[in-house]
């Protein structure tokens, strides 16, 4: 079965800056990726970015830049300042819509013991929902 992995990294240079990386481990064709924080999108989570493989990218503050890393993985840089900035225990979620598998979502947060600039290797996070 497909899996989604999520990796969260705090930048050493800017302690309020985060990089979120997400990937889809499946054979299907990805049609949309939605990144949110504070929980799954549409279930209390706040939209950070939506990436379509053909049509483009849309992002929401405090996202600075979302991009495709490969055909099945994305990254998102968050710029933290003020009320909308993330904190160390913030949960980030990535939802991949693919054909024919459907939608797969996983969430992750900064590893508790991670030093700035370090992060755990990208491993599959628990799958929260498969539509």
């Amino acid at each position: 079965t497909p899996e989604v992995w999520v990796q969260v990294r705090m930048e050493a240079t800017e302690l309020s800056s985060f990089t979120i990386r997400c990937g889809f481990l499946g054979s299907g064709s990805i049609s949309l990726v939605t990144v949110s924080w504070g929980g799954p999108n549409g279930a209390g989570g706040t939209t950070l970015a939506v990436l379509h493989p053909e049509r483009g990218i849309r992002q929401w503050a405090p996202a600075r830049q979302a991009r495709w890393e490969t055909q099945s993985s994305i990254s998102l840089i968050l710029e933290g300042s003020g009320a909308s900035s993330p904190c160390a225990n913030t949960t980030f979620c990535c939802k991949f819509a693919s054909f024919p598998e459907g939608s797969w979502e996983a969430c992750g947060s900064l590893p508790p013991s991670s030093d700035p600039g370090l992060s755990a290797p990208p491993t599959p996070a628990p799958i929260l929902r498969a539509d």
């Epitope: 999108n41 549409g42 706040t46 939209t47 049509r55 849309r58 495709w68 055909q71 993985s73």
Partner: antibody
Framework: QVQLVQSGAEVKKPGASVKVSCKAS????????IEWVRQAPGQGLEWMGV????????NYAQKFQGRVTMTRDTSISTAYMELSRLRSDDTAVYYC???????WGQGTTVTVSS | EIVMTQSPPTLSLSPGERVTLSCRSS????????????LSWYQQKPGQAPRLLIY???TRETGIPARFSGSGSGTDFTLTISSLQPEDFAVYYC?????????FGGGTKLEIK
């Protein structure tokens, strides 16, 4: 079929606010974000911002920050764009669009004049 | 913000002719991770809303005639109409779909010679 129907033309005085509505039908409203684009008379297209109807999250072009508010009412599949502190150069046709700008409303003419 | 520059501003042509419209972005719109260019083209006729023609620099939107084609990569893009029909005389806009804010070009007006 997908349809976006916007509210009617408005005439406003400088300093006032205007709220334009965009009623969506033919698709699941919360599954596609709505973008707003305006066009001043004889000018080109200007991207104003985007709202995710599912969560209500909005992001605005820097130029409009502090003056524009995008909201939605999921119960009636309608998105709204409110622009405050209107100036004469806000006179334009305001469009809503969905599905990555594949579908557009008919446009709402907003005239700002004293 | 990304600046989208279209040229020429106006073009006078006759039906049946082939036309190439140009759009240049101030920053590359190529997504290196998946090798896609996030550039769209729109057509707008007087008194009407814009109509999406091309997305991803070269993919025709559903229902768009085959005479419309898009090409280019990085910062330089073109929209080609292989044989102009009377209904093609309109204003054409390109749009950056990669970087916030998602700016449009100033447009190219196609008028009948």
């Amino acid at each position: 079929q997908v349809q976006l129907v916007q509210s009617g033309a408005e005439v406003k005085k400088p300093g006032a606010s205007v709220k334009v509505s965009c009623k969506a039908s033919g698709y699941t409203f919360i599954n596609n974000f709505i973008e707003w684009v305006r066009q001043a008379p004889g000018q080109g297209l200007e991207w104003m911002g985007v709202i995710n109807p599912g969560s209500g999250d909005a992001n605005y072009a820097q130029k409009f920050q502090g003056r524009v508010t995008m909201t939605r009412d999921t119960s009636i599949s309608t998105a709204y764009m409110e622009l405050s502190r209107l100036r004469s150069d806000d006179t334009a046709v305001y469009y809503c669009a969905s599905h990555w700008l594949a579908y557009w409303g008919q446009g709402t003419t907003v005239t700002v004049s004293s | 913000e990304i600046v989208m520059t279209q040229s020429p501003p106006t073009l006078s042509l006759s039906p049946g002719e082939r036309v190439t419209l140009s759009c240049r972005s101030s920053q590359s719109l190529l997504s290196s991770g998946n090798q896609k260019n996030y550039l769209s083209w729109y057509q707008q006729k007087p008194g009407q809303a814009p109509r999406l023609l091309i997305y991803g620099a070269s993919t025709r939107e559903t229902g768009i005639p085959a005479r419309f084609s898009g090409s280019g990569s990085g910062t330089d893009f073109t929209l080609t109409i292989s044989s102009l029909q009377p209904e093609d005389f309109a204003v054409y806009y390109c749009q950056n779909g990669h970087f916030y804010p998602y700016t449009f070009g100033g447009g190219t007006k196609l008028e009948i010679k």
